[in-house]
């Protein structure tokens, strides 16, 4: 019995050198959230602790900027940031909610290509 | 196919401890949803603590309000093993406890939906 519902920026593409702002938004549910975690598959990006704030993981302190909000800005992209991202919310008293985004980083190249032409 | 095995319940006077363990085959998602359940006698099941854990390092504990500050839920990865401390046991903590594993990690906590199940010790706390 599910109480609350995790939406999400679901599957996404961006420019490589780009930024992108990962998205989550628990709704549903009146519990109170106390830290959300964002993590790249099986790697710990931030954390964000209702009452410590913000902790940015030392490894993507340089490419990695909070917010807006609960989100996360990915700067700099490259294309090995193509993959799977989570949001992990906890909250009281209801448990753990997990949203998952793919995102996707095109060449340059690539995404100008795609916006110029069609295949018909 | 997954498996769950639990142990470690017994007869216990009120205010002592016991801990018990779920050791689970078949369970190797790199993210895990598991907790402990219990029934009480003539009573429906209640959830007591669920553990989500991922292999990129988060790890969230939930409680049910009765048990909160008395029961820690842990894990054993090398041994693939889920806990529950109890202390200060209570006449009405008296019930088969039961581990419970889930497939989807959307929701973890004491009122999800579980798709496996132990069979389940018995712990009766009594003078």
């Known amino acids: 019995m599910m109480t609350g519902t995790i939406e999400t920026t679901g599957n996404i593409s961006a420019e490589k050198g780009g930024s992108i702002i990962l998205q989550c938004h628990l709704s549903s549910t009146t519990a109170q959230v106390t830290q959300v975690n964002w993590e790249q598959q099986d790697q710990l990006l931030a954390i964000c602790n209702a009452d410590l704030g913000w902790h940015i993981s030392p490894s993507f302190k340089d490419r990695v900027a909070p917010g807006p909000g609960l989100g996360l800005t990915l700067q700099s992209l490259t294309v090995n940031d193509t993959g799977e991202y989570f949001c992990i919310y906890h909250t009281y008293p209801d448990g753990t909610y997990t949203g998952r985004i793919f995102l996707e980083v095109l060449e340059s190249s690539v995404a100008e290509h795609g916006a110029r032409f069609q295949i018909p | 196919e997954v498996q769950l095995v639990e142990s470690g319940g017994g007869l216990v006077q009120p205010g002592g401890s016991l801990r018990l363990s779920c050791a689970a085959s078949g369970y190797t998602y790199s993210r895990k949803c598991r907790g402990w359940f219990r029934q009480a006698p003539g009573k429906g099941l209640e959830g007591v603590s669920t553990l989500y854990t991922s292999s990129g390092g988060t790890y969230f504990d939930t409680y049910a309000d009765s048990v909160r500050g008395r029961f820690t839920i842990s894990r054993d990865n090398s041994k693939n093993t889920l806990y529950l401390q109890m202390n200060s046991l209570r006449a009405e903590d008296t019930a088969v406890y039961y581990c419970?594993?889930?497939?989807?990690?959307?929701?973890?906590?004491?009122?999800?939906?579980?798709?496996?199940w132990g069979q389940g010790t018995l712990v009766t706390v009594s003078s």
């Open positions: 419970a594993a889930r497939l989807s990690t959307d929701f973890c906590g004491p009122r999800a939906d579980f798709d496996y």
